[in-house]
């Protein structure tokens, strides 16, 4: 993503004591220069000159793309899903070759009844979306199908989907045990062979906000972390205020470097500040010595 953020320049002193001007860049930061036509702009860190300003790549911003942003947008999916591959054996319908053709009237009627039956079976599962028949084969009718589950993304989405898949297993086992043929007759919507019920595979959406955060932070990956607010993940550096991991720079400004977050301490007319967190103030002398 591209970012253009205007930045002002302030006189600051690093916690080591030297006065510097920000925006600034750590000497270890890689620098690339983008030159377009007659316009020469020092767009650093992969940024490029668009004719007016530097267009910066994540996680950089500033007039020359020399500063590191305090937070990076990460976008978890709105919903996450699971797909269960199941096999059940339906005994209340006899297999015919037409069932192999998904555009046949036989398949359409079977699909309608099977879907209705499964909707009844899974009606108490809020994550349940539906079923999709993938294959029908002889025996009476062996039904290979997918059960689709979906839920809103939360940090606990895997637990929610894991729990839902367990309930699916319980419910399909129950119905295929209870709805069985008696004297070659079925009084239910569908009857099953109890031993034909199998869960072949379960696939759950994989989304890791920490991984997305680290990837987008690039060489700063060790210093960006994920914190949650209202169940939404935020990819932040310690320089972002208002989070548990936020660095308090007191009388200074937080700045990211490739060695992590550091405080750049301010110097006022009356005090200069030092220390790792710019919390050590020293009053300036009122006497000025002229040489």
């Amino acid at each position: 993503p591209l970012a253009t953020i205007p930045v002002s320049t302030t006189s600051l002193t690093s916690s080591e004591g030297s006065t510097i001007s920000t925006p600034s860049v750590d000497i270890s930061t890689p620098v690339t220069t983008s030159i377009v036509g007659d316009q020469c702009s020092r767009c650093k860190n992969g940024g490029f000159w668009d004719g007016l300003k530097c267009q910066c790549l994540t996680p950089y911003y500033g007039e020359s793309c020399e500063e590191v942003v305090n937070s990076i947008d990460i976008a978890p999916p709105e919903t996450v899903s699971a797909q269960m591959e199941l096999t059940v054996t339906v005994t209340s319908v006899k297999f015919t070759d037409e069932l192999k053709n998904h555009s046949s009237q036989e398949f359409r009627e079977f699909n309608k009844t099977f879907t209705e039956q499964m909707n009844i079976v899974y009606s108490g599962i809020p994550e349940y979306v539906g079923v999709n028949i993938t294959n029908l084969r002889l025996g009476s009718v062996v039904v290979e199908h997918d059960v689709l589950l979906r839920t809103k993304y939360t940090p606990e989405y895997k637990t929610a989907l894991d729990n839902a898949t367990e309930v699916v297993k319980q419910k399909i086992t129950k119905v295929t045990t209870e709805q069985i043929m008696t004297n070659d007759n079925c009084s239910a919507l569908m009857c099953f062979n109890t031993t034909g019920t199998q869960v072949q595979n379960i696939t759950v959406t994989q989304y890791d906000p920490v991984e997305e955060c680290r990837q987008k932070a690039e060489e700063y990956e060790d210093y960006f972390l994920v914190e949650y607010r209202d169940q939404k993940p935020y990819c932040i550096s310690p320089c972002e205020s208002g989070f548990n991991a936020s660095k308090n720079c007191n009388h200074g400004k937080c700045q990211m470097s490739q060695n992590g977050a550091r405080c750049l301490c301010v110097t006022t007319e009356t005090h200069w500040y030092s220390g790792e967190d710019c919390n050590q103030g020293t009053q300036k002398s009122h006497h000025h010595h002229h040489h």
């Epitope: 005994t91 209340s92 319908v93 006899k94 015919t96 037409e98 009237q105 036989e106 009627e109 079977f110 309608k112 009844t113 209705e116 043929m181 070659d184 007759n185 079925c186 009084s187 239910a188 919507l189 569908m190 009857c191």
Partner: nanobody, 123 residues
């Protein structure tokens, strides 16, 4: 799409007979399943007599020995011969069909229905 039209219903005295017919349009008569269901006032629809193309037949216990299901493939017609009729046989009789070879008595598994014909057994 299969279309079903029943006929032959009416009023009959206890012990009497009726023959219901169900004419089917479409080319699916030789395959699948065919049947007769009935629904008495205030009761659920129930299977009376069913037949599938692989030879399976079903009769409700209450009609065994009295009712006979048959079909004439050349005429695309299903029949229900009802003998020794009783007052409790009074109901609307529905013809049902499915292209599937079914073994189920549950009306929800049957996809095609006629509009029904009324049978009243009364003295």
């Amino acid at each position: 799409e299969v279309q079903l039209v029943e006929s032959g219903g009416g009023v009959v005295q206890p012990g009497g007979s009726l023959r219901l017919s169900c004419a089917a349009s479409g080319d699916t008569f030789s395959r699948g399943s065919w049947g007769w269901f009935r629904q008495a006032p205030g009761k659920e629809r129930e299977a009376v007599a069913l037949i599938s193309s692989d030879g399976w037949t079903f009769y409700a216990d209450s009609v065994k020995g009295r009712f006979t299901i048959s079909q004439d493939n050349s005429k695309n017609t299903l029949y229900l011969q009802m003998n020794s009729l009783r007052a409790e046989d009074t109901a609307v009789y529905y013809c049902a069909a499915s292209v599937l070879v079914l073994r189920t008595l549950n009306p929800k598994a049957w996809h095609h229905w006629g509009q029904g014909t009324m049978v009243t057994v009364s003295s």
